[in-house]
């Protein structure tokens, strides 16, 4: 996250960190006690079974008692994900156990299925443990920045016609650099307490107003998300599982 600030610890309890070989790699968010939403491109060249999902974290390198760590039992990328264009860049991660909900681990609500994205100019927040500058500086803890929804046609023009209707864009609202950066991928864009966007890609430089940040528009995939969750029973789960609605 560039141009943002460190959040109050555990104030974004839905945030998930996806790590490989002990290093944070992508973000995600908890929507069900067994399921985390992330970006499909995070797993294009990575074996999901080698990854770990950490919930309840603030400073990833600190051994916080609130942290819950899971391996990935299954990773379900959207069947129409296109790496060449990053269309349909969304993935569901099934945890190998059930998240225990509490003050530091909570679910994030999804938008209603096929809901219109927030209007241009709407203020939203994006969070993550990605770099805080183009120098690939790691953050001290979970970071967040306020951004504004940008009209998709304006954004598509900035992106030389590469976008599709199931994407969403944000900008800083001024000429300052504010937005996401490498390793924020998969994290949520939260507008009105719902995950309307999922971090997908940005331009040559983090937060560059010339190439606005691009997200997967979550509302376009809500039906698919719950179809996948419903189709898969929680392995080893004896209690009832909880989902955000």
């Amino acid at each position: 996250i560039v141009g943002g600030h460190e959040v109050t610890p555990h104030s974004r309890p839905y945030m998930a960190s996806v790590s490989f070989e002990g290093h944070h790699y992508c973000g995600g968010f908890l929507i069900h006690t067994h399921w985390v939403v992330s970006a499909a491109h995070c797993f294009s060249d990575r074996d999901p079974s080698m990854g770990l999902v950490v919930l309840g974290a603030h400073a990833l390198l600190a051994p916080e008692p609130t942290q819950q760590t899971f391996s990935i039992a299954a990773a379900v990328s959207h069947p129409d994900f296109q790496p060449a264009t990053q269309a349909n860049d969304i993935c569901l991660l099934r945890l190998n156990g059930s998240a225990v909900l509490g003050p530091a681990v909570r679910l994030l609500r999804l938008p209603r299925r096929n809901a219109k994205p927030p209007a241009a100019g709407t203020r939203c927040h994006v969070s993550g443990w990605g770099f805080v500058s183009d120098f690939e500086e790691p953050p001290p803890g979970l970071m967040e920045v306020e951004v504004r929804i940008l009209d998709l046609s304006v954004c598509n023009s900035s992106w030389q016609g590469q976008l599709n209707p199931a994407m969403l864009c944000t900008h800083s609202g001024d000429r300052r650099r504010r937005g996401f950066c490498s390793a924020d991928s998969g994290g949520p864009l939260v507008c009105g307490r719902r995950a309307h966007g999922l971090v997908s890609f940005s331009g040559l430089w983090c937060g560059d107003p010339k190439t606005p940040d691009v997200y997967t528009q979550v509302s376009a995939f809500v039906t698919w998300i719950w179809d996948v969750v419903r189709a898969s029973s929680s392995p080893g789960s004896t209690g009832r599982s909880v989902r955000a609605v």
């Epitope: 790496p83 990053q86 860049d89 183009d134 890609f201 331009g203 560059d208 107003p209």
Partner: antibody
Framework: EVQLVESGGGLVQPGGSLRLSCAAS????????IHWVRQAPGKGLEWVAW????????YYADSVKGRFTISADTSKNTAYLQMNSLRAEDTAVYYC????????????WGQGTLVTVSS | DIQMTQSPSSLSASVGDRVTITCRAS??????VAWYQQKPGKAPKLLIY???FLYSGVPSRFSGSGSGTDFTLTISSLQPEDFATYYC?????????FGQGTKVEIK
């Protein structure tokens, strides 16, 4: 040792096509953006195109937009520049370059490949 | 697009001289400027990034400074191998743009 090796240059008629390749070694291709930069004979440097580390997004200079396409095959550690509808003003040495950090500079460059557009 | 204007376009200097090349951006680019050295028939080599950071392996006689719109590359004591063309480049706003180059020749 980091290496970038371009190939595919040559003489082509106006309106023709060429595909340049940039074979990378010594670094993780999927961890770094790749750029093409060109230099017309006796002139300065001009940035042409970029492809992100994931290969999922691209950006082009206005002068080549709609005619050139940058792509990458991460399994082969190779980037490509497909050049269509070539013009005399596209004549240049084409370099591929690797990003330092998040594109703060170009830290490694290939040796360049000459593209000549002439009838 | 941001224009990068270098001056002078060429200069003559002797070994041991202190050489200064300037680069002016058409709008604020913060400290996102890199400097490169290029010799005839060769690819450019990175010297300085983010206005003042010396790239690994580059001799300490090279230094960079500036922020906003005005930037400087200084060679404190010119060596025979430094005769080349030098380019600045902004890395702040898409697309990246280069200066037109400054050719450093032997006096």
């Amino acid at each position: 040792e980091v290496q970038l090796v371009e190939s595919g240059g040559g003489l082509v008629q106006p309106g023709g096509s060429l595909r340049l390749s940039c074979a990378a070694s010594g670094f993780t291709f999927s961890g770094s953006g790749i750029h093409w930069v060109r230099q017309a004979p006796g002139k300065g440097l001009e940035w042409v195109a970029w492809i992100s580390p994931t290969g999922g997004n691209t950006y082009y200079a206005d002068s080549v937009k709609g005619r050139f396409t940058i792509s990458a095959d991460t399994s082969k550690n190779t980037a490509y520049l497909q050049m269509n509808s070539l013009r005399a003003e596209d004549t240049a040495v084409y370099y591929c370059a690797k990003s330092l950090f998040h594109n703060v500079a170009f830290d490694y460059w290939g040796q360049g490949t000459l593209v000549t557009v002439s009838s | 697009d941001i224009q990068m204007t270098q001056s002078p376009s060429s200069l003559s200097a002797s070994v041991g001289d202190r050489v200064t090349i300037t680069c002016r951006a058409s709008q604020d680019v913060s400290t996102a400027v890199a400097w490169y050295q290029q010799k005839p028939g060769k690819a450019p080599k990175l010297l300085i990034y983010s206005a003042s950071f010396l790239y690994s392996g580059v001799p300490s006689r090279f230094s960079g400074s500036g922020s906003g719109t005005d930037f400087t590359l200084t060679i404190s004591s010119l060596q025979p191998e430094d005769f080349a063309t030098y380019y600045c480049q902004q890395a702040n706003s898409t697309p990246p743009t280069f200066g037109q180059g400054t050719k450093v020749e032997i006096k």
